[in-house]
């Protein structure tokens, strides 16, 4: 029997019946064995076929077989119901070898020309499988010349058998208090040859509860307990299972905080697997009862390990742990069934005793000593000498624990001294210097410090004076001895004040005229206002209307009198304002330099002389009565004048205060 070509020779060629294309002889038997390389198969087709037709091809035939399997027995020229001729069919070996046998019997009724066939080796596509046959690979099949290989989807690994995909299903750890886990691909069939381990690991104190849900289908056996595929559940206390079959296992209350679930599958079967819903429980904590005036959040039916709640107080109430205020409160349930913190109280906000108001008092409106939420207090200032600035003095204890005014201010109101009060009434007559009576000039300040000078009290801690009077002490403010509340210059009965700082107008040049002759002294303490110590008012914008030419102002001081000595008793003089041009002209002639009188000055006195301020009065106030407010205000500051006080045709020159209101206000607000 002639043999066909053997691999690795090129595997292709032609086969023909003996004598082709002539007729074949009787009693012929010819056999060809074709072999292809591994991973290849043989393809064969006929270009000519003419054999004697017989029932079931018993007489003459061509038989194709591959291994033990007969692929076809062929005869005739065309196929019939019981016989087959190749026609245009192509035949394929099952493996890499193909046997072809030709046989003719002892006779032919007429001549037959036999057959001609061609063959070739071709790659087998192992990935193509016939319907109903098992796939070559579990997941992905990759064909190549001479062979194939399998690969797996993510989450799987190729088994040793090179075809099966085992699930990578170990090492998953569940730490949430509840969750779901299932067999790989659930509810689709689970993978073969897999070993899965799942862990549920909760904090100590929790107990895991397992519920099998939906469906359960794990390969089983009628006689043996779960020999193929099985599910096992292990805790530190006991083992549950193995489980298999189609019945949902019962709930498992593990009484453990750690559970290991093992699922093992073999190489066969087609089952959907399982799904577990797990929950956990723990020893519950006592139900939190909200304190009066508070509420619990969130509200739950029960609270177990790690559950928490917060307490929120109603408006006007605050969280207190005993005496300790809390910004917030959250308690957490512990594993022993107790809360980690004791329940706080929601106590009514207490603003506490209100601060004392300097020069004022406070009255409890709601009730004696009541300082809790919504309580009302009323501040008021000491009558006559103080007036309330900023608000009406009514404060309410608000939810933030602060006394708050109706305007929303949390700072105290201010009792500002009433200015410009005097016991003196003015008749408008001009007459000689007179002794002041108690309460006539309560703003009068005596300044001692090298020389005698004067000033006027502003508010309750500032003194307005002339720059030249305190220039020497500008760097040594504490050297100034400031006295008030007395009429007698030498009296031991006075209110002492001390200077904290001296502010001289930056436009003042010492010994170079008296322009900007103005200064402020800040006292180191506030003085108590009474009928003998009261501040002078600063001029309003409209004050110029009370300071026209011939309007009467009053100067007071302990300066030199006609007798040439400092006055023992406070003296005052009423003098008219002098026309500015007239005054300027009076000081244009020698010995006064031109421009001595500036727009920052005003003049007062009699043309005939005799009434004037003098040395020792420097810094004192020239005051006017504001007939609208009925308060006295400072219009001028005693500054300079002729060498001989009260000289005819000469006038007292005063710093014009209204020009310096912004300067005064800036310094007082800044310091």
């Amino acid at each position: 029997t002639p043999l066909g070509p053997k691999w690795p020779e090129p595997v292709f060629g032609r086969l023909a019946s003996p004598g082709f294309p002539g007729e074949y002889a009787n009693d012929q038997e010819r056999r060809w064995t074709l072999t292809a390389p591994p991973g290849y198969r043989l393809r064969l087709y006929f270009t000519h076929f003419d054999l004697e037709l017989s029932h079931l091809c018993e007489y003459d035939f061509v038989k194709l077989s591959s291994g033990a399997k007969v692929l076809a027995t062929l005869c005739g020229q065309e196929s019939t119901d019981t016989e087959r001729a190749p026609g245009k069919d192509t035949f394929y070996s099952l493996g890499s070898s193909l046997d072809i046998t030709f046989r003719s019997d002892y006779s032919n009724e007429k001549p037959f020309t036999g057959f001609e066939a061609f063959y070739a080796a071709e790659d087998i596509d192992e990935c193509q499988v016939a319907p109903g046959e098992a796939p070559t690979c579990d997941h992905h099949c990759h064909n190549h010349l001479g062979g194939f290989y399998c690969s797996c989807r993510a989450g799987y690994v190729l088994h040793r058998n090179k075809r099966t995909c085992s699930a990578l299903c170990s090492g998953q750890v569940f730490t949430q208090r509840s969750g779901e886990l299932s067999s790989p691909e659930y509810p689709r069939p689970y993978p073969k040859l897999s070993s899965c381990t799942y862990s549920i690991s909760l904090e100590e104190g929790f107990s895991v509860i397992l519920d099998f849900v939906e469906s359960f289908d794990v390969e089983t056996h009628p006689e043996t307990l779960c020999p193929y595929d099985f599910l096992k559940i292990q805790t530190d206390r006991e083992e549950h299972g193995p489980f298999c079959g189609k019945t949902l296992p019962h709930r498992i209350e593990t009484k453990s905080n750690t559970v290991t679930i093992t699922f093992v599958t073999d190489e066969s079967g087609d089952h959907t697997g399982w799904k577990i819903h797990y929950t956990s429980t723990a020893q519950p904590c006592p139900y939190p009862m909200a304190p009066p005036n508070g509420h619990v959040s969130p509200v739950q039916a029960k609270y177990i390990l790690k559950d928490s709640f917060s307490i929120f107080c109603e408006t006007g109430y605050e969280l207190l742990q005993g005496h300790l205020p809390l910004k917030s409160f959250t308690a957490v349930c512990q594993k022993d069934g107790s809360w980690d913190r004791p329940m706080p109280a929601c106590s009514i906000v207490d603003c506490g005793p209100p601060d004392d108001l300097p020069s004022g008092r406070v009255e409890y409106i709601t009730g004696p000593g009541v300082t809790t939420y919504k309580a009302v207090i009323q501040y008021s200032c000491e009558e006559t000498f103080y007036t309330m600035k900023v608000n009406d003095g009514k404060y309410v204890c608000e939810a933030d624990g602060f006394w708050t005014s109706s305007k929303g201010e949390k700072s105290l109101p201010v009792c500002e001294p009433v200015c410009g009060l005097s016991a003196r009434t003015t008749g408008g007559r001009i007459y000689g210097g007179q002794k002041a009576k108690p309460g006539d000039f309560p703003w009068q300040v005596l300044i001692l410090g090298g020389t005698t000078a004067a000033g006027a009290l502003l508010y309750d801690n500032w003194v307005l004076t002339a720059a030249h009077a305190v220039y020497e002490q500008k760097h040594d403010a504490s050297a100034l001895d400031i006295r008030m509340g007395t009429l007698k210059r030498l009296s031991p009965h006075y209110t002492q004040a001390w200077s904290e700082a001296v502010f001289i107008h930056e436009g003042y040049t010492h010994d170079a005229g008296f322009d900007n002759d103005i200064a402020l002294i800040k006292l180191n303490n506030k003085v108590v206002i009474n009928s003998n110590i009261t501040p002078i008012c600063l001029p309003r914008k409209e004050a110029e209307s009370f300071m026209r030419t011939d309007d009467i102002g009053t100067a007071s001081g302990w300066g030199l009198t006609q007798r040439g000595f400092l006055a023992r008793n406070l003296m005052y003089v009423d003098i008219p304002i002098v026309d500015h041009q007239k005054c300027t002209a009076a000081y244009e002639k020698p010995p006064y330099p031109r421009g001595s009188v500036t727009a920052n000055m005003l003049c007062a006195g009699l043309e005939s002389g005799g009434k004037d301020s003098c040395r020792g009065d420097s810094g004192g106030a020239l005051v006017f009565l504001d007939s609208e407010t009925e308060r006295w205000f400072v219009g001028g500051i005693v500054s300079w004048g002729s060498m001989n006080c009260g000289e005819a045709g000469q006038y007292g020159v005063y710093t014009k205060v209204i020009n310096y209101i912004p300067w005064i206000e800036n310094i007082i607000s800044d310091f």
Epitope: P292, H323, P342, M343
Partner: antibody
Framework: QVQLQQSGPDLVKPGTSVKISCTAS????????INWVKQRPGQGLEWIGW????????YYNENFKGRAMFTVDYSSSSAYMLLSSLTSEDSAVYFC???????????WGQGTLVTVSA | DVVMTQTPLTLSVTIGQPASISCKSS???????????LNWLLQRPGQSPKRLIY???KLDSGVPDRFTGSGSGADFTLKISRVEAEDLGVYYC?????????FGTGTKLEIK
Amino acid sequence: QVQLQQSGPDLVKPGTSVKISCTASGYTFTDYYINWVKQRPGQGLEWIGWIFPGSGSPYYNENFKGRAMFTVDYSSSSAYMLLSSLTSEDSAVYFCTRGDRSGPFAYWGQGTLVTVSA
Amino acid sequence: DVVMTQTPLTLSVTIGQPASISCKSSQSLLYSNGKTYLNWLLQRPGQSPKRLIYLVSKLDSGVPDRFTGSGSGADFTLKISRVEAEDLGVYYCVQGTHFPFTFGTGTKLEIK
């Protein structure tokens, strides 16, 4: 005025329990915490814990957890301390105190002497 | 726990003379609201303790102004300007800032 009246002295056997009462008057009982303090003979003071009558919520010093239990009775404005598993170490004077916003020890009861002896 | 250390253990003072007791805590007693919950108590012989001073320096009503409390953080002092016979007893400092509240070891004031 605020008053805290405590129950009288008690002689108890080791291993048993004792319940001390503290009856409050002169203020709203539910508004302020009640503290309990232990003083052993000739020794210093030790805070046992407190209870807030407004919620009935107690808090215990770890040294007394599991042995001391605080309760309140609103009808009599009374606070109670139950001390269990007594030993000779528990022989002491026990005080109840009431706090205010400035601290827990503003007002003191007169004290209850507990003697643990076989 | 916060440890409260008092010195001296015993103080022997002549009537009319000043006295001073120190109390140190193992950590600051300043609470988050800016207040320091440090009290001074006096326990006269055979009596319950009585609070003299709260919030470091505030005197309870009825307490004579010869008692003054001072300090901050973890260092506190109780001073008596002129000791009187009724002042004898054991003085305790106690903190109410941290749980559990803790007492000082006590200082016994004796009259010389």
